[in-house]
Amino acid sequence: SGTTNTVAAYNLTWKSTNFKTILEWEPKPVNQVYTVQISTKSGDWKSKCFYTTDTECDLTDEIVKDVKQTYLARVFSYPAGNVESTGSAGEPLYENSPEFTPYLETNLGQPTIQSFEQVGTKVNVTVEDERTLVRRNNTFLSLRDVFGKDLIYTLYYWKSSSSGKKTAKTNTNEFLIDVEKGVSYCFFAQAVIPSRTVNRKSTDSPVECMGQEKGEFRE
């Protein structure tokens, strides 16, 4: 059938952060090329990454069309130089990916503390609302635009001189925390989607401490 030396892809894996979504697979091709197809449950398969020797395919453009749909991808293997060749079932060898629902599964990217401002015994901490590749009306939506109140942030903060951490939560991107006057504090933030069963939390933001350039201080 011409597929004697063609092997099916395996270990198909979704890698997705803030909806930037790449399908990866093995093996590195030897005398073969790959084409990827992706579909929702509609079965309207769309081909991407035609006859590639890569072992990854960026499917972001497809999944951002509706991040709440569930997607399946499949990777077809063809002999290099003979892409018309088919397997014994009359079609090229292929393997299916696991199902992937971006809204429920994309990893939350590492947040960034955009600014903090102290006014007396209060500190207002703002977490950057990161832009995603999800579009609406030709503009890119932020993480908050996409997830709404499903997304919360947790702030961990502590006196620079001690290790005991306190926490605060917000379903906006801003925290207002109580601090002791004249005492320096450090903090980091984490994005969380409490309703999820997987990939609930992001990695921690870089630690920021009062007295560094991001802060403003007012009596």
Epitope: S39, T40, K41, S42, G43, D44, W45, Q69, L72, S88, A89, G90, E91, E95, N96
Partner: antibody
């Protein structure tokens, strides 16, 4: 509740035609591939045809290729199977089914009976 | 086409028995297999997809296993409602069903 209701079955002579319909409710019809599966009296299940959510992709079993046409009207939430050049061996209960990705059937209708006989 | 062979074609069992049905594919289908239950005069009902994923609402006494060419459907403790015919279906290349296994009362 997801429901599928077939209609259009009946008695037809060999060489005749019949159009089956399947009315869907309880889910976003265009979001799913749909299919037809048949079962001859006292026999097992046989896949007949599948259509993608947009209607742009269709697949047929060799036994019906060129004689049967699957279609859908998403505005009416209805799936169709146009059966031409019918043969005695097409006699069966025809089931309509919701088919995620066009792969497996997670919801089935109750079926409609087609009898091809002179 | 990929052929699916089920065994046994008929199985006699009693309530409470552990029942195993086998399905073999003529070539590797990875895990792309579904199991259905059908009662006389009724439509089939999906039990298992992707070889081992239990469909929502299906009792946990049903389980599926296997990959490649050999698959099993297991009913851990047969209940009166389980006497029926069971079909496997591959969806690796188009769709084909096994011939069915009738589970009857011993």
């Amino acid at each position: 509740e997801v429901q599928l209701l077939e209609s259009g079955g009946g008695l037809v002579q060999p060489g005749g035609s019949l159009r089956l319909s399947c009315a869907a409710s309880g889910f976003t019809f265009s979001d799913y591939a749909m299919g037809w599966v048949r079962q001859a009296p006292g026999k097992g299940l046989e896949w007949v045809s599948t259509i993608s959510g947009s209607g742009g992709l269709t697949y047929y079993a060799d036994s019906v290729k060129g004689r049967f046409t699957i279609s859908r009207d998403n505005s009416k939430n209805t799936l169709y199977l146009q059966m031409n050049s019918l043969r005695a061996e097409d006699t069966a209960v025809y089931y309509c089914a919701k088919a995620p990705y066009g792969y497996y059937m997670d919801v089935w209708g109750k079926g409609t009976t087609v009898t091809v006989s002179s | 086409d990929i052929q699916m062979t089920q065994s046994p074609s008929t199985l006699s069992a009693s309530v409470g028995d552990r029942v195993t049905i086998t399905c073999r594919a003529s070539q590797s289908i990875s895990s792309w297999l579904a199991w259905y239950q059908q009662k006389p005069g009724k439509a089939p009902k999906l039990l298992i997809y992707k070889a081992s994923s239990l469909e929502s609402g299906v009792p946990s006494r049903f389980s599926g296993s296997g990959s490649g060419t050999e698959f099993t459907l297991t009913i851990s403790s047969l209940q009166p409602d389980d006497f029926a015919t069971y079909y496997c279906q591959q969806y690796k290349s188009y769709i084909t069903f096994g011939g069915g296994t009738k589970v009857e009362i011993k």
